[in-house]
């Protein structure tokens, strides 16, 4: 759902043409057009992390970055390369929530993010290569899926304190990256405009050299940039106990087996708890709908069993410094 606009090439002024005011005033709209050429493509982000507490558990965070309203969210998991997957929970904004063992609690965190807790009986080894997928549907626009998994080397019983490190999720990094390029482009454009201040203004016209002029692509600052600073999230504390899947899941379980320890969920704390807390050295795998994957070590907040909605306690300053963890 990305819209594109063709940006006309800047041609040198034709001989004999003066840089009239009429021509000069055309420059500003085009500069502005390059800034807001496109609307952001909806994307889904997922973060998976294993908790290291008495019981075994995964923490997964999923969210939808897009303007459309969500009509359905499906959370699933399975083995590597799409092997032996099954649905864990389905969340419908109007018709309710369905979940299947070992899912313990599915919930909406915000209008564009969900939370799910999966817990088992506490085994010692992590689920190697387990993949978790979140699929967000926005009717009638379409649906988008992102998947995340723990690196096989993840150690739930890490005793050494993790090293804090600033993290940017893949989707936010993408937005900021494009914004940076845009900003640079704008500054450069303004620089060129100042250089040609006392010369005849260049005449704007579509390029005749190629049938398709270069296309400028960018996130609309008014929409995407704000979304980046108010990223909703969902936390899924999931424990890998697929043994319960075949017996309890009405749709039949996967053919693969693995085990993960789970932990007791804690209730969310106030903003102060986000201030300066360590982030695991070995992080989760973040995936974005377009297939970009980035390692992230952010530790998501623990969510309690309650169904009360709460916004991101960090507010609009969420991008400052390392993402907080308890």
């Amino acid at each position: 759902m990305r819209t594109e606009a063709q940006v006309p090439a800047l041609q040198p002024p034709e001989p004999g043409l003066e840089g009239a005011m009429g021509h000069r005033t055309l420059v500003l709209p085009w500069v502005l057009l390059t800034l807001c050429v496109t609307a952001g493509t909806p994307e889904v982000w997922v973060q998976v992390r294993m908790e290291a507490t008495e019981l075994s558990s995964f923490t997964i965070r999923c969210g939808f970055l897009g303007s459309g309203s969500i009509s359905l969210v499906t959370v699933s998991w399975g083995g590597p390369n799409g092997a032996g997957g099954t649905t864990l929970a389905v969340l419908h904004p109007e018709r309710g929530i369905r979940q299947w063992a070992p899912a313990r609690q599915a919930r909406w965190e915000t209008q564009s993010s969900i939370s799910l807790i999966l817990e088992g009986s506490g085994a010692s080894s992590p689920c190697a290569n387990t993949t978790f997928c979140c699929k967000f549907a926005s009717f009638p626009e379409g649906s988008w899926e992102a998947c995340g998994s723990l690196p096989p080397s993840s150690d739930p019983g890490l005793s050494a304190p993790p090293t804090p490190a600033p993290i940017l999720r893949a989707d936010l990094a993408g937005i900021l990256g494009v914004s940076g390029v845009l900003l640079f482009g704008c500054v450069y454009l303004l620089h060129l405009l100042r250089r040609h201040k006392h010369r005849p203004a260049p005449r704007l016209q579509p390029s005749r050299t190629s049938p398709q002029a270069p296309r400028a692509r960018a996130w609309a600052p008014s929409q995407a940039s704000q979304a980046a600073l108010h990223v909703p999230y969902a936390t899924i504390n999931t424990s890998c106990r697929p043994a319960t899947l075949d017996t309890a899941h009405p749709h039949g379980g996967p053919s693969w087996w693995a085990s993960l320890p789970t932990h007791a969920a804690h209730r969310p704390q106030g903003p102060a708890a986000w201030a300066s807390t360590p982030i695991p050295a070995r992080g989760s795998f973040v995936s974005v709908e377009n297939g970009l994957y980035a390692q992230a070590g952010e530790r998501p907040p623990h969510t309690g069993p309650g169904l009360t909605l709460f916004p991101d306690p960090r507010g609009p300053r969420a991008m400052e410094g390392p993402l907080g963890v308890r």
Epitope: S71, L72, E289
Partner: nanobody, 127 residues
Framework: EVQLVESGGGLVQPGGSLRLSCAAS????????MSWVRQAPGKGLEWVST????????SYVDSVKGRFTISRDNSKNTLYLQMNSLRAEDTAVYYC????????????????????WGQGTMVTVSS
């Protein structure tokens, strides 16, 4: 972006057969239950059949039991619906959808109740 593309529809005589296909892309097909739903002219959306993620369980609406067979090939990311002994009342637009409508009940079904949906393929049974 997730895409579901149905094919195989067409005009067939009563008692004839058709095989619908649904090619899926943009998501981990093998992790999800898939269904076929249909909408007859002037009618609401009706569930037809569902198959779970590993093809270990299938279910059908009573009116098609013994005539329709749902299947999937996870290696090809494709869902199928083999329709035999077709009747005039099977005339409808058939949609491939992700999800099981039984999750929230079959009443007042809408495409928005599913995680993904295709554009539909028309099946006309007429002599």
């Amino acid at each position: 972006e997730v895409q579901l593309v149905e094919s195989g529809g067409g005009l067939v005589q009563p008692g004839g057969s058709l095989r619908l296909s649904c090619a899926a892309s943009g998501f981990t097909f093998s992790y999800y239950d898939m269904s076929w739903v249909r909408q007859a002219p002037g009618k609401g959306l009706e569930w037809v059949s569902t198959i779970n993620s590993n093809a270990g369980r299938t279910s059908y609406v009573d009116s098609v039991k013994g005539r329709f067979t749902i299947s999937r090939d996870n290696s090809k990311n494709t869902l199928y619906l083999q329709m035999n002994s077709l009747r005039a009342e099977d005339t409808a637009v058939y949609y491939c959808v992700e999800g099981d409508p039984h999750n929230f009940g079959l009443e007042s079904l809408s495409l928005r109740d599913f995680g993904s949906w295709g554009q539909g393929t028309m099946v006309t049974v007429s002599s």
